[in-house]
């Protein structure tokens, strides 16, 4: 009889453990933000991209905040950050100002408490996009593991924003917490 009670107690304890694990997982911060194509800056200079979706299509956010074009960390921890930026041009959309392009992405961390800004990751290449080619495409993907503190902000800068691919599966960035800071 006592064996049966112990087994039942273990099952209850186990399910509580699962529930606790699950609720902890559900509280794990993550964000996947996709480009807002209605508000992409023009030109070829380096700009900060401030318009991103956080709640439509593939875009989702939980236990993080998106404000003023920046992804804000709400919990200290080690996070995996990633960004995918696609550049494209088709001749029917106009001409290129120059055939020699520097196509770049910069993932930047800004700290409000100690005002400072650091480039965490950058990627890209110089490209020759001939005016005689009908279509051009180039993709950059960067990712890395970073210690982030509550209140720190992540933002994205790109060169040649007018060449950004506006699709949600092309231009996006995100983060998810992997573990606590010991």
């Amino acid at each position: 009889g006592s064996q049966h009670i112990r087994a039942e107690k273990a099952m209850v304890d186990g399910s509580w453990l699962d529930l606790a694990k699950r609720s902890k997982l559900e509280a794990q911060p993550f964000a996947h933000l996709t480009i807002n194509a209605t508000d992409i800056p023009s030109g070829s200079h380096k700009v900060s991209l401030s318009s991103w979706y956080h709640d439509r299509g593939w875009a989702k956010i939980s236990n993080m905040t998106f404000s003023n074009g920046k992804l804000i960390v709400n919990q200290d921890g080690f996070y995996y950050l990633y960004a995918n930026i696609c550049f494209r041009h088709h001749e029917t959309s106009g001409d290129l100002a120059t055939e020699y392009l520097q196509l770049m992405v910069y993932v930047t961390k800004t700290s409000i408490k100690i005002p400072s800004s650091h480039t965490l990751m950058k990627g890209g290449s110089t490209k020759y996009w001939s005016g005689n080619s009908e279509f051009h495409f180039y993709s950059i993907n960067v990712g890395g593991f970073f210690k982030l503190r509550s209140g720190e902000e992540i933002s994205i800068e790109v060169s040649n924003p007018s060449l950004l691919d506006p699709d949600q599966d092309a231009t996006y960035f995100g983060a998810f917490k992997v573990r606590d800071i010991d």
Partner: antibody, heavy 118, light 111 residues
Framework: QVQLQQSGAELASPGASVKLSCKAS????????LQWVKQRPGQGLEWIGA????????KYTQKFKDKATLTADKSASTAYMQLNSLTSEDSAVYYC???????????WGQGTLVTVSA | NIVLTQSPASLSVSLGQRATISCRAS??????????MHWYQQKPGQAPKLLIY???NLESGVPSRFSGSGSRTDFTLTISRVEAEDAATYYC?????????FGGGTKLEIK
């Protein structure tokens, strides 16, 4: 629809300068090269050069490098061509033009006649 | 610079007959699998009008009696059955390479 409206005819003295204008409408002015073409009376077409109005990049045929200066005013969606040190050889109709969505010059201004005469 | 040589310089064709104009480039105007050669029609006192782009593509609104062919250095504009309104000067143009250049023109007269 795409339209290119050019300024009126010019009568100029030898050695003087003229500035021709071309106002674009019906498309985003800063996303296409705007070209200029010369045609002397009874003669063929000559490509002068082009300007990309966004950053103001320019390209010229060698023989027009010292003759023509291309500029653009983004806020007015207007391109300009200044011709300096005018001679009788500069008497011609000057067209501004833009390529089509694929290729080839599909859109032309009505042309500006420049007459150089003492 | 790429030099475009048109022939003949002038052409007289009877109404309903075929007209053929040739344009030869001093070097290839092909790149990325396309031929960057275009054809224009110009009537007196008017701006040129694009007929054919990329060697063989008919511009919207242009009658189907106009056609273009060729690649690399040799190109042809054909009017299958000439009509009275086709009397004009015809120019070829390349934009494969800066500076863009035009042919000297072919004047078509209708008999």
């Amino acid at each position: 629809q795409v339209q290119l409206q050019q300024s009126g005819a010019e009568l100029a003295s030898p050695g003087a300068s003229v500035k021709l204008s071309c106002k674009a409408s019906g498309y985003t002015f800063t996303t296409y090269w705007l070209q200029w073409v010369k045609q002397r009376p009874g003669q063929g077409l000559e490509w002068i050069g082009a300007i990309y109005p966004g950053p103001g990049n320019t390209k010229y045929t060698q023989k027009f490098k010292d003759k023509a200066t291309l500029t653009a005013d983004k806020s007015a969606s207007t391109a300009y061509m200044q011709l300096n040190s005018l001679t009788s050889e500069d008497s011609a109709v000057y067209y501004c033009a833009r390529r089509g969505s694929r290729r080839g010059i599909a859109y032309w201004g009505q042309g500006t006649l420049v007459t150089v005469s003492a | 610079n790429i030099v475009l040589t048109q022939s003949p310089a002038s052409l007289s064709v009877s109404l309903g007959q075929r007209a053929t104009i040739s344009c030869r480039a001093s070097e290839s105007v092909d790149s990325y699998g396309r031929s960057f050669m275009h054809w224009y029609q110009q009537k007196p006192g008017q701006a040129p009008k694009l007929l054919i782009y990329l060697a063989s593509n008919l511009e919207s609104g242009v009658p189907s009696r106009f056609s273009g062919s060729g690649s690399r250095t040799d190109f042809t504009l054909t009017i299958s059955r000439v009509e009275a309104e086709d009397a004009a000067t015809y120019y070829c143009q390349q934009d494969n390479e800066d500076p863009y250049t035009f042919g000297g023109g072919t004047k078509l007269e209708i008999k």
